[in-house]
Amino acid sequence: MMTGTIETTGNISAEKGGSIILQCHLSSTTAQVTQVNWEQQDQLLAICNADLGWHISPSFKDRVAPGPGLGLTLQSLTVNDTGEYFCIYHTYPDGTYTGRIFLEVLESSVAEHGARFQIP
């Protein structure tokens, strides 16, 4: 039985050209996290494997940094980065937990700076 829950940063906004941390946290389970995948709707951004470490997809290598922790830092943001991001926790023995974050990248300085995991 899957008892865990994923807490995410929820809906966040950031300025074009800036950086943002995508962060998820799995709680309420003793399951072992074997891998965390970070994905957009149609492509893989990165994988953090418990044995093998981080793999950043080639198309994101120049502007995605691993961490902090199991999170992911997106740099040099563009308006095209607006959209849904998913953290997918592969665990044993529970199975898969998925969290969703919506990022809006804004043209000007109207971006909110109050998001809990956001880089100022």
């Epitope: 149609d42 494997n49 044995d51 093998l52 981080w54 793999h55 997809s57 080639p58």
Partner: antibody, heavy 121, light 107 residues
Framework: DVQLQESGPGLVKPSQTLSLTCTVS?????????WSWIRQPPGKGLEWIGY???????NYNPSLKSRVTISRDTSKNQFSLKLSSVTAADTAVYYC??????????????WGQGTSVTVSS | DIQMTQSPSSLSASVGDRVTITCRSS??????LAWYQQKPGKSPKLLIY???SRYSGVPDRFSGSGSGTDFTFTISSLQPEDFATYYC?????????FGGGTKLEIK
Amino acid sequence: DVQLQESGPGLVKPSQTLSLTCTVSGHSFTSDYAWSWIRQPPGKGLEWIGYISYSDSTNYNPSLKSRVTISRDTSKNQFSLKLSSVTAADTAVYYCARLDYGNYGGAMDYWGQGTSVTVSS
Amino acid sequence: DIQMTQSPSSLSASVGDRVTITCRSSQHVSTALAWYQQKPGKSPKLLIYSASSRYSGVPDRFSGSGSGTDFTFTISSLQPEDFATYYCQQHYITPWTFGGGTKLEIK
């Protein structure tokens, strides 16, 4: 250039343990790579057996997990495969391969030439 | 485990032809998909990883595309040395699994 070379007996009796070694040359064995075993039965496709990481963590295919052990000897630049209780279904060409996970994920970039193992009495 | 299905299982073509092989996964694998070339009696060679990234030294006539569960591998203009068997592999989650292979033969 990185080179991998499998070695071990070409014939193993049913119920015995298959033991293979992969020797890595042209490469620092202690750096951030993982090392994998893959097999290919005659005329068939490829099956991933498992890996050992740079930190000595192992991960095995669940279909073989109860029979497989992968270990390494950094002083000899070698890693090995042991597969117990073999049957004719374990007859295959066995390959060792390198995992450069940071760059290529779980795609394997360097392979040995393979060694053929037949299980027969 | 994630099952990988390749089609066709065999294919006849001529030098200069454009050839396309498809690979379908039984579950979502995002863009974590690799393609290998294997010639008889030889070990597989990595051609494509992360669905569309060419491995170092691989000619640009080889390309890959797709995401999710449906993937395509294309050789834009077949050369004599390209006749071989091609395998897809998902590297999304262990156990990493391979397709059954596509044997590319001379017509």
